[in-house]
């Protein structure tokens, strides 16, 4: 996250980080507790998944296994629309006040609406600089309308931006998958965005969650 | 330091295939995509395709499809593109390069490998 | 697939000469062009990117500029060691990526 600020500690009980090993891969969301909801492109082979810490590489958080994924079978890698996917999580999380589910959205949230996105990924661009806490920011969606001024024929129908008005704050690497979260429900997957990051009015780019709860509903029923 | 170092000259004859590898140091590989770019004596940059070094998608260009194949050692960060059937027209010097960016799209390549002769003749 | 054509595909200059190269795309690509120097016997070496951003490291006397279909690099005025090959590329509609021509800059 670039321009962000600590998150308070515990507020975001539905973050997890996908390690590779021990190493950062993406962000995700617990949806259910055999379930995350991350970005299609963070696929990997398998995956370490740390829950219920606001520190990567905490010693005394949930680590679980995780060797399944499904990925939208829409995904492009031309256009990267449906960038979504679910990890499936080799044995349950124990649920607290530190490990909580999302709450996926009922509606699409309108143009406006302020949200936070969360993630350990770099504080810095080019060069990168990875925290130990998780970093939020405080974002507003934008219209598909403005967006497109950005990134023209680049935004597909299920992508959703984000961003302030002439702020350098946004995503960036290790981001990825991670969680934007607006009045208390999740909005979008951090997907991608112009780089070096953080270069005001170029908004970061989301994948919409409310067009797909159908999809992840389904999908976790399919694959119980 | 940040690099990327390509396998040595290769003379092989038509029909052959040839597999040219390209490592990586001095950053996260699985982070990035790599990409293969190739430049025959004299003429301009022809991009391959790419892979992505975590998941192992790929995205090869239309007139090499069927022939070219790009893989991944996550285990020592190295790249691999191997060309088969090859044709005196695949003389080259092949160039591994590293996309900028983050997520699910990149935009310009910021680091590339040294090159890697290959000649093909009879 | 987005074609690149660039002109000049060669010039001659002196040292001191202000240089233009441009780089047109068939269709528009927005503002994500980049520019790269290659010499002989070595890999391209990223200059410019976002049609305009100076890469890190690279002089301050090449700049480039456009957006859409048309765009141009500039040497402000023309040193011994830029004596190269210029590429444009486009990162927009990918893949594939497609290259222009290529543009020699030589000595007059």
């Known amino acids: 996250i670039i321009d962000g600020y600590k998150c308070k500690e515990g507020s975001h009980p539905w973050q997890v980080a996908l390690l590779k090993g021990n190493q950062l891969h993406c962000g995700g969301v617990l949806v259910d507790k055999y379930w995350v909801l991350t970005a299609a492109h963070c696929k990997m082979g398998q995956y370490q998944v740390q829950l219920g810490s606001d520190k990567i590489g905490d010693q005394s958080a949930q680590k679980i296994k995780a060797t399944k994924s499904f990925r939208h079978p829409g995904y492009s890698t031309k256009t990267h629309v449906n960038d979504i996917m679910l990890v499936r999580l080799d044995e349950p999380v124990k649920m607290s006040s530190k490990v909580e589910a999302v709450q996926l959205p009922e509606h699409c949230e309108p143009p406006g609406t302020s949200c936070t996105v969360s993630g350990w990924g770099t504080t810095t661009s080019p060069d990168v600089t990875f925290p130990s806490d998780l970093m939020c920011s405080d974002v507003k969606l934008i219209s598909s309308r403005e967006c497109k001024k950005v990134y023209k024929d680049l935004l597909g129908k299920t992508m959703l931006c984000a961003g302030i008005p002439d702020s350098k704050t946004n995503t960036c690497n290790g981001d990825s998958g991670g969680p934007l979260v607006c009045n208390d429900t999740l909005q979008g997957l951090v997907s991608w965005g112009t780089y070096p990051c953080g270069q005001p009015n170029d908004p970061g780019v989301y994948t919409q969650v409310c067009k797909y709860k159908r999809w992840v509903m389904e999908t976790m029923k399919t694959h119980r | 330091q940040v690099q990327l170092v390509q396998s040595g000259a290769e003379v092989k004859k038509p029909g052959a295939s040839v597999k040219v590898s390209c490592k990586a140091s001095g950053y996260t590989f699985t982070s990035e995509g790599i990409h293969w770019v190739r430049q025959a004596p004299g003429q301009g940059l022809e991009w391959m395709g790419s892979?992505?070094?975590?998941?192992?998608?790929?995205n090869y260009a239309q007139k090499l499809q069927g022939r070219v194949t790009m893989t991944t050692d996550t285990s020592t960060s190295t790249a691999y593109m191997e060309l088969r059937s090859l044709r005196s027209d695949d003389t080259a010097v092949y160039y591994c390069?590293?996309?900028?960016?983050?997520?699910?799209?990149?935009?310009?390549?910021?680091?590339w490998g040294q090159g890697t002769m290959v000649t093909v003749s009879s | 697939d987005i074609q690149m054509t660039q002109s000049p595909s060669s010039l001659s200059a002196s040292v001191g000469d202000r240089v233009t190269i441009t780089c047109r795309a068939s269709q528009s690509i927005s503002s994500y062009l980049n520019w790269y120097q290659q010499k002989p016997g070595k890999a391209p070496k990223l200059l410019i990117y976002g049609a305009s951003s100076l890469q890190s490291g690279v002089p301050s006397r090449f700049s480039g500029s456009g957006s859409g279909t048309d765009f141009t690099l500039t040497i402000s005025s023309l040193q011994p060691e830029d004596f190269a090959t210029y590429y444009c590329?486009?990162?927009?509609?990918?893949?594939?990526?497609?290259f222009g021509g290529g543009t020699k800059v030589e000595i007059k």
């Open positions: 390069a590293r996309a900028a960016g983050y997520g699910a799209r990149h935009w310009y390549f910021d680091l």
């Open positions: 892979i992505s070094a975590s998941s192992g998608d790929t």
């Open positions: 590329d486009q990162f927009y509609s990918t893949p594939p990526i497609t």
